[in-house]
């Protein structure tokens, strides 16, 4: 999916008002210095591509983020403010229902959510030069 035509300001507002808080809740009890940010993004569409991938694609050691509150809200924001995104999710949603897993917070998941926090912060500062 190409995130170029999303309403970035509305997605940013949703992040600031609610998604960010859910990410913090998920990470509660973890030191902010515990994980190094290894995933980066260069512009808003690229950031959303990386955010979508890290949030919804199962990875080794962390297969359960999609059912977290921040993930549900991310999915809603993309479906509402990214033209045509919801259509791409119809088959994906049906497939996800079949492979629903119980929520388990592993260290790998905490690291992944830490990366997500970094991607979202970068999404909110699109004019900053990539370091």
């Amino acid at each position: 999916y190409d995130f170029t035509n999303c309403d970035f300001e509305k997605i940013k507002a949703a992040y600031l008002s609610t998604i960010s808080k859910d990410l913090i809740t998920y990470m509660s009890g973890t030191k902010s210095t515990e994980f190094n940010n290894t995933v980066s993004c260069s512009n808003r569409p690229h950031c959303l591509t990386e955010i979508q991938s890290l949030t919804f694609n199962p990875t080794a050691g962390c297969a359960s983020l999609a059912k977290e509150m921040f993930a549900m809200k991310t999915k809603a924001a993309l479906a509402i403010w990214c033209p045509g995104y919801s259509e791409t999710q119809i088959n994906a949603t049906q497939a996800m229902k079949k492979r629903r897993k119980r929520k388990v917070t592993t260290n790998k998941c905490l690291e992944q959510v830490s990366q997500l926090q970094g991607l979202w912060r970068r999404f909110n500062r699109p004019l900053l030069k990539q370091q």
Epitope: S17, A76, A79, T93
Partner: antibody
Framework: QVQLVQSGPEVKKPGSSVKVSCKAS????????MHWVRQRPGQGLEWMGT????????DYNQNFKGRATITADKSTSTAYMELSSLRSEDTAVYYC?????????????WGQGTLVTVSS | EIVLTQSPGTLSLSPGERATLSCRAS??????VHWYQQKPGEAPRLLIY???QSISGIPDRFSGSGSGTDFTLTISRLESEDFAVYYC?????????FGTGTKVEIK
């Protein structure tokens, strides 16, 4: 079963406001956005805007921006649409309709409609 | 905003006949089109979503097709309860818009 029950008919004077309610039951309120659609007598359907309980935010058709306010009370699973500065052209049936925001993504259940008549 | 134009405005057919309703979008909207049926004094009822996805409880004589800008709702054999107004709607981007409507009436 899923039900959206709207408030009763209203007769209003030009320049006044109207607030229509839509009480939802039979599903998890925060899993769905609540859209508002109006239909003038003998005319087609016009999307006014939506409230997304999961994100606590609303979005509007620019044609109604500033005049329409869409809100919800999550504790009672009730959505509201307030339209101000009413004029005769606002005489219409107003519908609420739910739409999944993490699945389905379509207006699959509608309220029965609320007739608002604007007349001096 | 995305404009949806439905044709014909009115379709006069007899029970048992096939009805073909068209919806054309002013720009590419992939398959983000849904079809509704509305009878006098009633709220719209969802028939087909995302161009061709069927809804449980809707008779299988209703089917949808199309993508991009051109979409079609087909009623294979009209029953007496099918005479109504049909609307297409796009959810590709805000503001959501509805088509102008096609009235299917008894010939």
């Amino acid at each position: 079963q899923v039900q959206l029950v709207q408030s009763g008919p209203e007769v209003k004077k030009p320049g006044s406001s109207v607030k229509v309610s839509c009480k939802a039951s039979g599903y998890i309120f925060t899993d769905y956005a609540m859209h508002w659609v109006r239909q003038r007598p003998g005319q087609g359907l016009e999307w006014m805007g939506t409230f997304i309980p999961l994100l606590d935010t609303s979005d509007y058709n620019q044609n109604f921006k500033g005049r329409a306010t869409i809100t919800a009370d999550k504790s009672t699973s009730t959505a509201y649409m307030e339209l101000s500065s009413l004029r005769s052209e606002d005489t219409a049936v107003y519908y609420c309709a739910r739409m999944g925001v993490t699945h389905s993504y379509v207006m699959d259940a509608w309220g029965q409609g609320t007739l608002v008549t604007v007349s001096s | 905003e995305i404009v949806l134009t439905q044709s014909p405005g009115t379709l006069s057919l007899s029970p048992g006949e096939r009805a073909t309703l068209s919806c054309r979008a002013s720009q590419h909207i992939s398959r983000s089109v849904h079809w509704y049926q509305q009878k006098p004094g009633e709220a719209p009822r969802l028939l087909i979503y995302f161009a061709s996805q069927s809804i449980s409880g809707i008779p299988d004589r209703f089917s949808g097709s199309g993508s991009g800008t051109d979409f079609t709702l087909t009623i294979s054999r009209l029953e007496s309860e099918d005479f109504a107004v049909y609307y297409c709607q796009q959810s590709y981007s805000f503001p959501y818009t509805f088509g102008t409507g096609t009235k299917v009436e008894i010939k």
